[in-house]
Structure formats: C-alpha cells, structure tokens
C-alpha cells in the first residue's frame, strides 16, 4: 500500500482580521494509526495550535468529524484571526506510541492576515508659527497588513507634494506602521485651513481613512496697527483710536502710553471676526488737551499671544488746541468698542 501523504492544498490563505481562517489538511491513508497535530512554524520553536488527541484549543475547531474512525480530513478553522496569527501552519501526522512520534508533515500553509490601518493621527508643531514660515506635520497609522499602503497629504483639498513617508519595518512582519512628515507654508489666510492625511489600504474597501489638523492650532497672525485722531469731540477733547487688525489667536493685550508713561492697559475681549478667521479690535483714548502744555506722543502698544510688543505712535499737537483757563488736571478716558467709538 502507498505510504501516507499529508496534503495541505493551500500554499497560502489570506483572511481579514476578525474573520475565521480555514486551513485544509487531508491524509491519503489511515495507516499508521496516530493523531494529527497542527503547528505554527517549524523546528524546535514551533507552536502547537491543535492536538487531535488532547488539550484545550478554544479558537480552533475541526471542519469535519475528526473523531470518526475513517476520517481523513483534518482541516481546522481558527476563529477571530489577528495579525499575530500570521505565519506558516503545518499539519503533522504522528505515529501512535509511547510517546507518539512524528511521522510526516504537510508542506505548510502560509496564513496572511489583512488588517486595517488605525485612524491616522496628525500632529503639528509644538509652537505657533507666522505666515510665510514652513511648518512640519506628521501623520501616523499603525497595525495594517499587507504592507502596501498609500498616503496622501492635502491642504484644503489641494494635494501636497512636499512630504516624506516611511513604512516600518522594512522586512517581513505581521503588521506595519506608516509615518509621514509634510511641509506646509503658512499664509495669512490659513486660520480656517485644514491639513489632511489620507491613508488608503486594500482592507478599507475604497474608503480611505483621514486624519486632520486645524491650522488654527498652528498659526499666529500678527496684528497690524493703525493709530488715528478722530475729529475733536469737544473743544478741548481729542479722541484717538488704535485699530488692531487681522490677528490670530485672540489673546492680545493693549497698552496706551502718553509720552512713554503707561496710561491704560486692557485685554481684547469684544472682538469682531473676519471671514478668514482673524480678528479685529479697536481701542480708543479720550485726551483732554487742556491738561497738556506741550505736544503729546501717544503710543498704542500691543502684546499678541506672548510675543514681543509691537507699537504705533501718534503725535498730538497741543498747540493747535485752545487751552481752557484754570484747567490743569488731565481728564482722560479710554474705551474700546467693536464698531463705534461710543
């Protein structure tokens, strides 16, 4: 009679993580008597997956009635497959004895597990940057298999080209990770912009995964200042306004200086938002010119988002205004308003 053969018809089997994998194995003879065992890997470090004779293997079930006397089908099903289950599985026939001895092994079936990538996580720079600067964003996704994966970067729907991507590890692995760094040049209009990392993989059924970063968390748009003198409100009062325009984020402190001396400090609270996401704010100072003998240098000094202060000055000509007799006290007011002076 022809010697028993162990037939594993499938060289490879590919399943999705979470599915069950069926590993086929048949023998061509009932002789010699003895059990079948399944192993992952070969050699002394091989891992026992299933033993027909004994043991508890909760994820493994036999496809046919392996306990029947004349059964020659020893195929198994492994449930809830994970990437860690990838490897080559061998169906091995043992000859009954004390102990049982290995008689013949099948050629092996390579199980590959198709696992979805994790949701991409996009992170930006630790510190804010101003327009015209180039900042780096990173995107990471993990746990996918097979290794082939496509990663694209977008800014507001426009594909970016300045990026570098690595898939690790370089060699064979049960699962892989991708890491990509993109360079983005900031513009003043980027407060509402988004940077998107898009990952496409065969397990995603054509629906790429996306990770986003809002440039509002990255950008700092410094304000532009304009100090103007409003028409005289009363004979001896002048209204000076400081327009703080196009800044982001909102964190801003304004100080009025008269001839270098602090007159008033206030924090931007009631601001107006521009369409591009930047803010405008206005502060005003009411100066009683009769309290001044000489010309006054008024300075609007702004500290934005913890950055060094910027300032704009305005020279108030006192000589151009008639003095009110007997008045020698300063009567100054400051205020701020979204749109109107009052």
């Amino acid at each position: 009679e022809e010697e028993l053969q162990v037939i594993q018809p499938d060289k490879s089997v590919s399943v999705a993580a979470g599915e069950s994998a069926i590993l086929h194995c048949t023998v061509t003879s009932l002789i010699p008597v003895g059990p079948i065992q399944w192993f992952r890997g070969a050699g002394p470090a091989r891992e026992l997956i299933y033993n027909q004779k004994e043991g508890h293997f909760p994820r493994v079930t036999t496809v046919s009635e392996s306990t029947k006397r004349e059964n020659m089908d020893f195929s198994i099903s492994i449930s809830n497959i994970t990437p860690a289950d990838a490897g080559t599985y061998y169906c091995v026939k043992f000859r009954k004895g004390s102990p049982d001895t290995e008689f013949k092994s099948g050629a092996g079936t390579e199980l590959s597990v198709r696992a979805k990538p994790s949701a991409p996580v996009v992170s930006g720079p630790a510190a804010r940057a101003t327009p015209q600067h180039t900042v780096s964003f990173t995107c990471e996704s993990h746990g996918f298999s097979p290794r082939d994966i496509t990663l694209k970067w977008f800014k507001n729907g426009n594909e970016l080209s300045d990026f570098q991507t690595n898939v690790d590890p370089v060699g064979e692995s049960v699962s892989y990770s991708i890491h990509s760094t993109a360079k983005v040049v900031l513009t003043r209009e980027d407060v509402h912009s988004q940077v998107i990392c898009e990952v496409a993989h065969v397990t995603l059924q054509g629906d790429p995964l996306r990770g986003t970063a809002n440039l509002s968390e990255t950008i700092r748009v410094p304000p532009t200042l304009e100090v103007t003198q409003q028409p005289v409100r009363a004979e001896n009062q002048v209204n000076v306004t400081c327009q703080v325009r196009k800044f982001y984020p909102q964190r801003l402190q304004l100080t009025w200086l008269e001839n270098g001396n602090v007159s008033r400090t206030e924090t931007a609270s009631t601001v107006t938002e521009n369409k591009d996401g930047t803010y405008n704010w206005m502060s005003w100072l009411l100066v009683n010119v009769s309290a001044h003998r000489d010309d006054v240098k008024l300075t609007c000094q702004v500290e934005h988002d913890g950055q060094p202060a910027v300032s704009k000055s305005h020279d108030l000509k006192v000589s151009a205004h008639p003095k009110e007799q007997g008045s020698n006290t300063a009567a100054e007011n400051t205020g701020s308003n979204e749109r109107n002076i009052y």
Epitope: S14, R114, V202, G206, D207
Partner: antibody, heavy 118, light 109 residues
C-alpha cells in the same frame, strides 16, 4: 451563498439613458467595494467603475468621460449604474463584481446585455 | 493609459503545469498593482481566481496560484485539467483605475 444578479439591460437609442441594477445576496453590501465591468461583443473585459463600501468614494474609467455614474443603496443591498448619452460603442454585456478586499474580484454576476442602436 | 498584455493563446495537456503571464506597459508589475486573474467559461460565466497578486478565492482549486515572475504577474495551473479550458483575464490596478488584459485562451488537449 454569494449571488449577484444584474437587471435593467435592453435596447436603447444613441443618446438615450439606461439604469442597470445589481441585486446582491448572501453578504452585506456595505462591507464590500463593488465594480462594474463590461465586455463588448467578441472583445475582452473593460473596467467601468468602482463604488467604495460606503458609497462615498467612486472611481471611474477616464474613457467614459463622466457619462456613467455608479451608486448604491446599501439598505437594499443593490448596486446601480446610471448610463447617459449612450453610444453604439457602449454596446456590451455589463457585469457587476464584488471586490473581496479592494484588490480582489471574487464574485461576478451573470451580466446584463445593453444594446445601443437606432 | 497603461496597456496590459497577455499571451493570446496557450495549449497544454491534462496533468501538465502551465503558466500564463501578464505584462504592464508602464514597467515591472509589483504587488501594488494587485494582480487579479479572472476565468471566463462559455456562456459568460466569470470566476475570480486570484486577487492581490497571490490570494486564491475561497473555493477555487489549489492548482491555481498567482505570483510575480520577473517583471510580470503570473497565473500557474499545476496539473491542468480539461475543465480548466477557458479564457483567463488578468487585471492590474494603477492608483485609481483597473486595466484588464486582452485575455489568454487556454486549450487543454
């Protein structure tokens, strides 16, 4: 058992429109990308379009110049192909096929014949 | 657009091993082209045999296997049988679209 059954084929005049359906059974449509592939009489296969599992993303053959639109109703387990501005060269048997992953045409329907002729 | 080329016809005998190939006009076929092999039998009966270069569709006999040989995708039938007589199409993925080859008519005499 996985089954794909196309319907909606027939004779249509040049410039006309037709809507093909593909009724899927034996699996949940939303878990799979689906494709339309056509075969002109005596010719080979030509890929037409893919709909992603959710239906949110579509991929179309450039040669069709936007005349064909793939869509799906996952609640009804049905795939569609809306064909507009039909031409004589669109005459073919149209097959819907399931993609096991995004890279693996595993099951095919029996096809629906579309004839464009005046 | 890329052109995918296959042998127009091949003949083999029962029990023999036969290899069908699939070439891309853009260069070497890689795993990123996700080579597919589809069988067409009379009466327009199509069966997906291989996907993603080397994954056999459940239920397809083990004698069918997919691989990359040199710069081409390949379908190997080990121990061909008379019922394997059919037309075999390969398909390759190019970033956002599939392209099918012209098909190989396999005769098993």
């Amino acid at each position: 058992e996985v089954q794909l059954l196309e319907s909606g084929g027939g004779l249509v005049q040049p410039g006309g429109s037709l809507r093909l359906s593909c009724a899927a059974s034996g699996f949940t449509l939303s878990s799979y990308a689906m494709s339309w592939v056509r075969q002109a009489p005596g010719k080979g296969l030509e890929w037409v379009s893919i709909s992603s599992g959710s239906g949110a993303n579509t991929y179309n053959a450039d040669s069709l110049k936007g005349r064909f639109t793939i869509s799906r109703d996952n609640s009804k387990n049905t795939l569609f192909l809306q064909m507009n501005s039909l031409r004589a060269e669109d005459t073919a048997v149209y097959y819907c096929a399931r993609l096991r992953f995004f890279d693996w045409f595993d099951y095919w329907g029996q096809g629906a014949l579309v004839t464009v002729s005046s | 657009q890329a052109v995918v080329t296959q042998e127009s016809a091949l003949t083999t005998s029962p029990g023999e091993t036969v290899t069908l190939t699939c070439r891309s006009s853009t260069g070497a076929v890689t795993t990123s082209n996700y080579a597919n092999w589809v069988q067409e039998k009379p009466d327009h009966l199509f069966t997906g045999l291989i996907g993603g270069t080397n994954n056999r569709t459940p239920g397809v006999p083990a004698r069918f296997s997919g691989s990359l040989i040199g710069d081409k995708a390949a379908l190997t039938i080990t121990g061909a049988q008379t019922e394997d007589e059919a037309i075999y199409f390969c398909a390759l993925w190019y970033s956002n679209h599939w392209v099918f080859g012209g098909g190989t008519k396999l005769t098993v005499l």
